[in-house]
């Protein structure tokens, strides 16, 4: 199984290393998740030709995946630390149902899919500690999530492959934008 950040052999071998700051820990956690996504994408791309499809073609989907927009305060123009942090946490919470969908979608990378899901939960906890304005964070409705999950799982094979690919790509892009913004905070 993939080893979570802070538990690799290098860390064990260097007990006198300075403990990671909150920001460093978040940075490392996101990079760990990105590595996991990369491994999952490898399996997906080997299995189907979705990865060759153009971004424009893939944009024509009815998935409501979280995406960074200018108004979210995470880009340089209009950068706003608090607004951005709320968007990152809200977006990650919204991705959780899609990460649940990814479970059982992988044959050789089953553990990796679980690791991405669990690491994201940990990341959300790290970020919630960093956020001052937790009241502004809306948690997705569990009933809505349950029916969405059922709907996604009822799709035909081709659509499930497409959905898997889109979730991985969108989650990667969301994490990249999030981490770039967090590196400015």
């Amino acid at each position: 199984a993939p080893v979570p950040p802070g538990e690799d052999s290098k860390d064990v071998a260097a007990p006198h290393r300075q403990p990671l700051t909150s920001s460093e820990r978040i940075d490392k956690q996101i990079r760990y998740i990105l590595d996991g996504i990369s491994a999952l994408r490898k399996e997906t791309c080997n299995k189907s030709n979705m990865c060759e499809s153009s971004k424009e073609a893939l944009a024509e989907n009815n998935l409501n995946l979280p995406k960074m927009a200018e108004k979210d305060g995470c880009f340089q123009s209009g950068f706003n630390e608090e607004t951005c942090l709320v968007k990152i946490i809200t977006g990650l919470l919204e991705f959780e149902v899609y990460l649940e969908y990814l479970q059982n979608r992988f044959e050789s990378s089953e553990e990796q899919a679980r690791a991405v899901q669990m690491s994201t939960k940990v990341l959300i906890q790290f970020l919630q500690k960093k956020a001052k304005n937790l009241d502004a964070i809306t948690t997705p409705d569990p009933t809505t999530n349950a029916s969405l999950l059922t709907k996604l799982q009822a799709q035909n094979q081709w659509l499930q492959d497409m959905t898997t690919h889109l979730i991985l790509r969108s989650f990667k892009e969301f994490l990249q934008s999030s981490l770039r913004a967090l590196r400015q905070m």
């Epitope: 892009e173 990249q176 934008s177 981490l179 770039r180 590196r183 400015q184």
Partner: nanobody, 124 residues
């Protein structure tokens, strides 16, 4: 790691323009974020601009904001730094760097590959 090669540097008058290029033969270069840094004689290396795997995610140092533009052409495995309204204080060796996570950032530690640099001199 990817091998990076910068080009396009030279001598230019104040107010002039230059376009720097950062190229690699790396197959997955489109997945990397690329940053430009610069180092003037006797000074620390400093962040100039970066571009994420998603080309719309660009950041600039305040000193170059509005004058420099970073862009990428993934078909050519190249990232460009268009430098306009150049000032004598822009004189430096310019380095490009790549981040395999596609994120980038304003600190050198975020990057895992570096080019050798290209000299830019702004003088009349």
């Amino acid at each position: 790691e990817v091998q990076l090669v910068e080009s396009g540097g030279g001598l230019v008058q104040p107010g002039g323009s230059l376009q720097l290029s950062c190229t690699t033969s790396g197959r997955r270069f489109s997945e990397y974020a690329v940053g430009w840094f610069r180092q003037a004689p006797g000074k620390e290396r400093e962040f100039v601009a970066d571009i994420g795997e998603q080309a719309e995610n660009t950041w600039y140092a305040h000193s170059v904001l509005g004058r420099f533009t970073i862009s990428r052409d993934d078909a050519k495995n190249t990232v460009y730094l268009q430098m306009d309204s150049l000032k004598p204080e822009d004189t430096a060796v310019y380095y490009c760097a790549a981040d395999k996570y596609g994120v980038g950032g304003n600190a050198q530690g975020y990057y895992d590959s570096w080019g050798q640099g290209t000299q830019v001199t702004v003088s009349s």
